[in-house]
């Protein structure tokens, strides 16, 4: 039931990568409109994306706030020429998502090999400490800063004309590996928080090989 | 430990009025919405209000909207439920529950019992 | 406002039984809903939330199910620890409480 030809938005789910946090959901409006709410465990309730046609809302300014809070949001629907109407409840027709604690659960980005430095048979590769949109003291953090030791990355590495790769990790974002002098080495990372339950990893970084722009080679 | 301790309940003449305290520990008080729910005496549950937790936002049942004010001071972790123009049916047993998002109650206190009565 | 109709009012069982309480809202309330049981002179206690999920700490035994306007909770096996009454609670517009269901020996 609910306000004539309004329908119940569906399918709410949250899209978030280092705290960049958007919530979407169901159906496409036909002559109607959503405003979204999202709140703490505390129940204030904050409006977002007012009387909008778009299925997406960002709610990334909300969730940085706190990011171990634990976030519900709800999607309102109102008749698209008369935001005033409400259900059968004496309210707007709405649904809740699912709930919603962004350090547990935004998925971990792409990580960057920002760079790779030979000396002898040492390699010093250097992960991108990636920036988010979590702010302190008018700051943005990085992920590192958010992280902390909750946060590994782990270095997949082999010679460039083998398979068999070898694995590294570190609690920085500098990795120290063992090479052969004057083989070539190729490598990827990924960042991991071990602790979690979901979206442990992140997907792999681009593959970096010795030998590219963005190596340096001492003796 | 989560505790919620209910405080100043009593019996009071029809027409009068009371106010019910709830004492919060073990959790961080203003991170919750809170809610106030009565029981009459053999009945069931029923709702009278809840409060968020900055208590910029708060919610009444029908039967006492008007009547009773829902309110929360942070600093001292309490919560309160100022009662007036009492009636006979308002005898119940309160209790004060932990609200998260203000939808359900994960956590109650034992409750104070009120009693309208000439 | 939305109405909460349980049944049995009182169910009569034996430790061991599975007991199936029935919940029905007078429109149709996603899944918020929440179980509640309450043992005489004592204050309620939450067991399910959401429908289905279960309350830290409250036994396996316990469980939730529905959607929309039909909801059970389901004790797979009766323990002398369960003989009370039990609420259904919705919180998709304000709250309501169901009537209860009284859980009694046979």
């Known amino acids: 039931s609910g306000t004539t030809n309004t329908v119940a938005a569906y399918n709410l789910t949250w899209k978030s990568t280092n705290f960049k946090t958007i919530l979407e959901w169901e159906p496409k409006p036909v002559n109607q409109v959503y405003t979204v709410q999202i709140s703490t465990k505390s129940g204030d309730w904050k409006s977002k994306c007012f009387y909008t046609t778009d299925t997406e809302c960002d709610l990334t300014d909300e969730i940085v706030k706190d990011v171990k809070q634990t976030y519900l949001a709800r999607v309102f629907s109102y008749p698209a020429g008369n935001v005033e109407s409400t259900g059968s409840a004496g309210e707007p027709l709405y649904e809740n998502s699912p709930e919603f604690t962004p350090y547990l659960e935004t998925n971990l980005g792409q990580p960057t090999i920002q760079s790779f430095e030979q000396v002898g048979t040492k390699v010093n590769v250097t992960v991108e400490d990636e920036r988010t949109l979590v702010r302190r003291n008018n700051t943005f953090l990085s992920l590192r800063d958010v992280f902390g030791k909750d946060l590994i990355y782990t270095l997949y590495y082999w010679k460039d004309s083998s398979t068999g790769r070898k694995t590294n990790t570190t609690h920085t974002n500098e990795f120290l590996i063992d090479v052969e002098k004057g083989v070539s080495y190729c490598f990827f990372a990924q960042a991991v928080i071990p602790s979690r339950t979901v979206n442990r990893k992140s997907t792999d970084s681009p593959v970096e090989c010795m030998g590219q722009e963005k190596g340096e080679f001492r003796e | 430990e989560v505790q919620l301790l209910e405080s100043g309940g009593g019996l009071v003449q029809p027409g009068g009025s009371l106010r019910l305290s709830c004492a919060a520990s073990?959790?961080?008080?203003?991170?919750?919405?809170m809610g106030w729910v009565r029981q009459a005496p053999g009945k069931g549950l029923e709702w009278v209000s809840t409060?968020?937790?900055?208590?910029?936002?708060?919610y009444y049942a029908d039967s006492v909207k008007g009547r009773f004010t829902i309110s929360r001071d942070n600093s001292k972790n309490t919560l309160y439920l100022q009662m007036n123009s009492l009636r006979a049916e308002d005898t119940a047993v309160y209790y004060c529950?932990?609200?998260?998002?203000?939808?359900?109650?994960?956590?109650w206190g034992k409750g104070t019992t009120v009693t309208v009565s000439s | 406002d939305i109405q909460m109709t349980q049944s049995p009012s009182t169910l009569s069982a034996s430790v061991g039984d599975r007991v199936t309480i029935t919940c029905r809202a007078s429109?149709?309330?996603?899944?918020?809903l929440a179980w509640y049981q309450q043992k005489p002179g004592k204050a309620p206690k939450l067991l399910i939330y959401?429908?289905?999920s279960l309350e830290s700490g409250v036994p396996s035994r316990f469980s939730g199910s529905g959607s929309g306007t039909e909801f059970t909770l389901t004790i797979s096996s009766l323990q002398p620890d369960d003989f009370a009454t039990y609420y259904c609670?919705?919180?998709?517009?304000?709250?309501?409480f169901g009537g209860g269901t009284k859980v009694e020996i046979k």
């Open positions: 959401k429908a289905s």
């Open positions: 529950a932990k609200a998260p998002y203000g939808y359900y109650m994960d956590v």
């Open positions: 409060i968020s937790g900055s208590g910029g936002l708060t």
């Open positions: 609670q919705q919180y998709k517009s304000y709250i309501t």
């Open positions: 429109q149709s309330i996603s899944s918020w």
């Open positions: 073990g959790f961080t008080f203003s991170d919750y919405a």
